[in-house]
């Protein structure tokens, strides 16, 4: 056959669907690869063809659109399963072509099983809620296009394995789930089950997402430098190792660029000639506030190094702060035989 622009296997688009549920999969060509939509392509006389390769097989085969009850069908640029079966897992290809043009892309589809508590290998989207922030909602995701607006589905919400009813601060409101005041105890997996009728049959859509309660922007503060501070003096003799930790607390802030860095005499450590190493560690609280520690280390400090200014800087979207470390040269303890004797007038 004539040449076809082959976009290969789009592994970035790892589609997972539940067994025995409807699934509608749009051809990715129009979403990510081509500059025109299906309507334009169709008007221009292009035809969309679907085929697939079963799991652990190399053979491309046409999709059987003549199954009982139209279990698999195509509508415009959408491939429909009503419902899926476990052995529908495989790589699916959609090809757009006419006599002079051809473009195709493949993508993996995985049909996964769930248990009675909705546990499965499905990768779950994460929805962040701000702690104690007032009413916040999550919406049952990816259910658009499954049924017309005239159909009124029933929606049941679950937290983990438990149906949400008479919960203190969580209220189901159709496709939405409202959190009156989100708390750490609200962390967890939430599932909506959407049930709707179609042609005398009843279908279920199961959608699970992870709720993570994070720090509220109302409580966010500029970075707080815990160390260095005014209470600790780094007193060293030349030749000793100098270790100064910079420990900074950052409030959680969506998309904030949180940074910590040292300057020595106003310059970044790698812009000066002394042998400095910086080691960094990062930890997070339950609400995703962040603590960063950068330890500045000079293996064998010189008397010159002990006269330098060591400043820890921190910055977030809330502001910038800096704190100098108190570094001084240790005064050697007096040696009795010489210094003290001199002091007593000995010769």
């Amino acid at each position: 056959s004539e040449r076809c622009d082959d976009w290969g296997l789009d592994t970035m688009r790892q589609i997972q669907v539940f067994e025995d549920e409807p699934a509608r999969i749009k051809c990715p060509l129009f979403e990510h690869f081509l500059k025109f939509n299906y309507s334009t392509a169709h008007s221009a006389g292009l035809t969309l063809i679907w085929y697939w390769t079963r799991q652990d097989r190399d053979l491309e085969e046409p999709i059987n659109f003549r199954l009982p009850e139209n279990r698999i069908s195509k509508e415009k640029d959408v491939l429909w399963f009503r419902p899926t079966l476990l052995n529908d897992t495989g790589n699916y290809t959609c090809m757009l072509r006419n006599t002079t043009y051809c473009s195709k892309v493949a993508f993996p589809l995985e049909v996964v099983q769930k248990d009675s508590c909705f546990n499965s290998p499905m990768k779950l989207p994460v929805h962040k809620l701000y702690i104690e922030y007032g009413i916040q909602r999550i919406t049952c995701p990816n259910v658009d296009g499954y049924f017309p607006s005239s159909v009124k589905p029933t929606i049941t919400w679950y937290m983990g394995c438990y149906k949400i009813q008479n919960f203190n601060n969580v209220i189901p409101e159709g496709m939405n789930l409202s959190f009156l005041i989100a708390l750490i105890s609200n962390n967890g997996n939430y599932t909506c089950v959407v049930t709707y009728p179609e042609n005398g049959r009843t279908f279920h859509l199961t959608r699970t997402l992870t709720v993570k309660v994070v720090g509220s922007p109302k409580n966010a503060v500029p970075p707080v430098i815990h160390s260095p501070n005014d209470h600790v003096v780094y007193e060293k003799e030349p030749g000793e190792e100098l270790l100064i930790p910079c420990t900074v607390y950052f409030s959680f802030l969506m998309d904030s660029r949180n940074e910590v860095w040292w300057t020595i005499d106003g310059k970044k450590p790698d812009d000066i000639t002394i042998d400095v190493t910086i080691n960094e560690s990062i930890s997070h609280s339950r609400t995703e506030d962040e603590t960063r520690t950068q330890i500045l280390s000079i293996k064998k400090v010189t008397s010159e190094d002990l006269k330098r200014s060591y400043v820890c800087h921190a910055r977030s979207a809330k502001g910038e702060v800096a704190k100098a470390a108190k570094v001084k040269q240790k005064v050697p303890a007096p040696r009795y035989t010489v210094e003290l004797a001199c002091g007593f007038g000995a010769t």
Epitope: D255, S256, R257, E259, W261, K268, D270, I278, E280, I282, Q294, R315, A317, G319, E320
Partner: antibody, heavy 117, light 107 residues
Framework: QVQLQESGPGLVKPSETLSLTCAVS?????????WGWIRQPPGKGLEWIGN???????YYNPSLERRVSISLDTSKNHFSLRLNFVTAADTAVYYC??????????WGQGTMVTVSS | EIVMTQSPATLSVSPGERATLSCRAS??????LAWYQQKPGQAPRLLIY???TRATGIPARFSGSGSGTEFTLTISSLQSEDFAVYYC?????????FGGGTKVEIK
């Protein structure tokens, strides 16, 4: 002094993967900073692609996120860019740069990548 | 994402005159803004960071000001080598974003 040098094929076919490497000289790529990629289509402005932190944490432009990956190889003192499923719209001059928290202070000279069959 | 808008798109100035370039952020970025200069066929060069601090080796005729959402780059007396495209960039939030650029051309 610090220098950055991009390298990679100047011509990539549509649907293939664009791979570029940025060699860092006069400086350790394992420093506690970021390394970034920026591109500039012909006659257009600058577009940030992504950054990689010394720890390996990556940050990407949301418009490219599903297609891009940046990696850091401290043993070779270089970092790399991979952009999947390229189209003509990815034709641009690609720059690598160093980001020491105060914006991109050192840039490579850039490498032109054309996407064409 | 934070959208950076530069104005004007083109600025026609005579050598020796003052040039004022504007950059606006769609939300507050404190003072976490950089300015770059780019000449044809060259990589951008960092001029200003932290909205007002000149990068190493940048002449004093370049100055930056502003905080929050409104920023200005001023070139006090344009030299022939200053005719170029200037970009602003915020690095307060991910994703990092650039303005569309202002071309400073000879009047």
């Amino acid at each position: 002094q610090v220098q950055l040098q991009e390298s990679g094929p100047g011509l990539v076919k549509p649907s293939e993967t664009l791979s570029l490497t940025c060699a860092v000289s006069g400086y350790s790529a394992s420093g506690v900073y970021y390394w970034g990629w920026i591109r500039q289509p012909p006659g257009k402005g600058l577009e940030w692609i992504g950054n990689i932190y010394h720890s390996g944490s990556t940050y990407y432009n949301p418009s490219l996120e599903r297609r891009v990956s940046i990696s850091l190889d401290t043993s070779k003192n270089h970092f790399s860019l991979r952009l999947n499923f390229v189209t003509a719209a990815d034709t641009a001059v690609y720059y690598c740069a160093r980001d020491r928290f105060d914006a991109f202070d050192i840039w490579g000279q850039g490498t032109m990548v054309t996407v064409s069959s | 994402e934070i959208v950076m808008t530069q104005s004007p798109a083109t600025l026609s100035v005579s050598p020796g005159e003052r040039a004022t370039l504007s950059c606006r952020a769609s939300q507050s970025i404190n003072n976490i803004l950089a300015w770059y200069q780019q000449k044809p066929g060259q990589a951008p060069r960092l001029l200003i960071y932290g909205a007002s601090t000149r990068a190493t080796g940048i002449p004093a005729r370049f100055s930056g000001s502003g905080s929050g959402t409104e920023f200005t780059l001023t070139i006090s007396s344009l030299q022939s080598e200053d005719f170029a495209v200037y970009y602003c960039q915020q690095y307060n939030n991910w994703p990092l974003t650039f303005g569309g650029g202002t071309k400073v051309e000879i009047k």
